[in-house]
């Protein structure tokens, strides 16, 4: 036979059963909590730095741009591209058509000033979709250029300048002193490219990576 | 890590707690009605507790001296 | 709801659900523990409370002094 | 040797017209834009009217936009002004220059000796 | 329009002293390397003769005594030694974007 254990024993031995599952559930709640917290505060910290970032990031563009239009790019909340409110934008960049009158080299530095080039042209699908916006009976000024007059046509953000994957109306270019672009409607063939003087006031189309946030 | 991911990962750690605890608290439960069962069909008897051969999880953790 | 809210929401369930069934299961234990001390008073001095070879969940975390 | 001959200067009435002609050689014409300048007595240089090597673009200053009109002839390597609705601030002698392009601007290299328009009732 | 502002309006000096006219754009008439400055020569009962281009660029026949610097909205022009026959009027002028404009001119007198 077991020897009975004493009333007290038992009582002191089922108290010392509670105590260490309680400690265990208070444990456990505990280690369920920081986790918690980890996972509520950490990403906290981590949007506010984001978003701190954004902020700083939105305040350079600001002077230049007091609205942006983003949309979010894929699934995820952190990733937003944006254009400058009044912009259109296509695939990774945003457009802008200037319609003031200047210059060639005056319609670039309007660009610079916005963050912005004087277009590039890169695919027919571009231009495809610049077109929408432009007036037949104007012409605008594309980011090309040949300032020696020796027909080393440039593009202003360095992209190398593909013949095969050039625009201009059939007889254009034509003249030696005729340095810059424009796109330019004509019946019979549609848009396409000219070259004119630089110096010739002209609307012009402004082109910018889209601003990722 | 980002933020998604460190969530995702709370999700899993969480998921796996609540699984486990789920399966010892159902196994536990089985126990007590098991117990109640035997109880009740021994009650004549002198056994009346849980089963004798039943382990508990973590029994292995610290073999403790059988009662004298 | 966007992906990430999604997630902080299942965060949410499955930590409720961890401290609910954390605490249901403690409960249960010691209701099992009384139990069997219970068990052991009304059984004229025979023991009949837990086996000798069963080892709860955590015990061994003390040295608890075996019955005399 | 380049040369440019201004010639059709005159005296004038207010509201009255004139057309000065610039003969140019020793260069080939068509392939340069070219430009009337005029200096009031005892100013300076003012531009007053441009046209392209291919005659595809004119430019005025608002001071004479709407009554002077440049043309060229290549085939006669002839500048044109036609001035009409004359002023008497348009009192001046008249040059006309050549072109010539330097990156996105121009210059201009060569000069005649110009023409003496005087507007006076 | 951009306006040419040249200074001083006129200048006295003695020959083989330096001469240096000054010519201050209202906007920029540069365009990264290319500062479209000109310079312009014109002595009394004469059309203006060219003598600097591209803000530097010396036009061919024009004496090496003439030199031209500047970039952005201030350019200058330097004839160092200064000749008697250099008695003359000098303008600056732009045509970076049309209307191509001239400065008011600075009058060069050797004492």
């Known amino acids: 036979m077991v020897p009975e254990e004493e009333p007290q024993d038992r009582e002191k031995g089922l108290w010392w059963f509670q105590l260490k599952v309680w400690s265990m559930a208070v444990v456990s709640i505990l280690l369920l909590s920081v986790c918690f917290t980890v996972s509520s505060v950490v990403p906290h910290n981590f949007m506010y730095s984001k978003t701190v970032k954004r902020l700083s990031k939105l305040r350079e563009y600001q002077q230049y741009h007091p609205s942006l239009t983003c949309v979010m790019e894929g699934k995820d909340i952190e990733d937003w591209s944006c254009c400058p409110t009044p912009w259109t934008s296509f695939q990774s960049s945003c457009y802008f058509i200037s319609t003031g009158m200047q210059s060639w080299t005056k319609s670039q530095k309007n660009c610079s000033v916005m963050g912005a080039d004087l277009v590039v042209i890169n695919t027919r699908e571009e231009q495809d979709f610049i077109i929408q916006n432009l007036k037949r009976n104007s012409s605008y000024f594309l980011g090309l250029s040949d300032p020696g007059g020796r027909r080393h046509w440039q593009w202003v953000d360095q992209t190398p300048y593909n013949e095969n994957v050039t625009f201009w109306h059939s007889g254009e270019p034509n003249n030696l002193d005729e340095r810059c672009a424009i796109i330019n409607f004509r019946s019979s063939e549609e848009w396409g490219w000219n070259d004119i003087h630089c110096h010739v006031p002209q609307k012009s189309i402004c082109k910018m990576k889209k601003i990722y946030i | 890590l980002g933020e998604p991911q460190l969530c995702y990962i709370l999700d899993a750690i969480l998921f796996l707690y609540g699984i486990v605890l789920t399966l010892l608290y159902c196994r536990l439960k089985i126990q007590v009605r098991k117990a109640a069962i035997t109880s009740y069909e021994k009650s004549d008897g002198v056994y009346t507790g849980l089963s004798t051969r039943n382990q508990e999880t973590y029994e292995t953790l610290k073999h403790e001296k059988p009662p004298q | 709801l966007g992906e990430p809210q999604l997630c902080y929401i299942l965060d949410a369930i499955l930590f409720l659900y961890g401290i609910v069934l954390t605490l249901l299961y403690c409960r249960l234990k010691i209701q099992v523990r009384k139990a069997a001390i219970t068990s052991y008073e009304k059984s004229d001095g025979v023991y009949t409370g837990l086996s000798t070879r069963n080892q709860e969940t955590y015990e061994t975390l003390k040295h608890e002094k075996p019955p005399q | 040797e380049v040369q440019l001959v201004e010639s059709g200067g005159g005296l004038v009435k207010p509201g009255g017209s004139l057309r000065l002609s610039c003969a140019a050689s020793?260069?080939?014409?068509?392939?340069?834009?070219m430009s009337w300048v005029r200096q009031a007595p005892g100013k300076g240089l003012e531009w007053v009217s441009t046209?392209?090597?291919?005659?595809?673009?004119?430019y005025y200053p608002d001071s004479v936009k709407g009554r002077f009109t440049i043309s060229r002839d290549n085939a006669k390597n002839s500048l044109y002004l036609q001035m009409n609705s004359l002023r008497a601030e348009d009192t001046a002698v008249y040059y006309c220059?050549?072109?010539?392009?330097?990156?996105?601007?121009?210059?201009?290299?060569?000069w005649g000796q110009g023409t003496t328009v005087t507007v006076s009732s | 329009d951009i306006v040419l502002t040249q200074s001083p309006a006129s200048l006295a000096v003695s020959p083989g002293q330096r001469a240096t006219i000054t010519c201050r754009a209202s906007?920029?008439?540069?365009?990264?390397?290319?500062?479209?400055m000109h310079w312009y020569q014109q002595k009394p009962g004469q059309p203006p003769k060219l003598l600097i281009y591209?803000?530097?660029n010396l036009e061919s026949g024009v004496p090496a005594r003439f030199s031209g610097s500047g970039s952005e909205t201030d350019f200058t022009l330097t004839i160092n030694p200064v000749e008697a026959e250099d008695t003359a009027n000098y303008y600056c002028?732009?045509?970076?974007?049309?209307?191509?404009?001239f400065g008011g001119g600075t009058k060069v007198e050797i004492k």
């Open positions: 906007e920029s008439v540069s365009f990264r390397t290319s500062h479209l």
């Open positions: 020793g260069f080939t014409f068509s392939s340069y834009g």
């Open positions: 046209i392209s090597s291919g005659d595809s673009y004119t």
């Open positions: 591209g803000a530097s």
């Open positions: 220059a050549r072109q010539i392009y330097y990156d996105y601007a121009y210059y201009f290299d060569f």
């Open positions: 002028q732009q045509s970076i974007e049309d209307p191509p404009t």
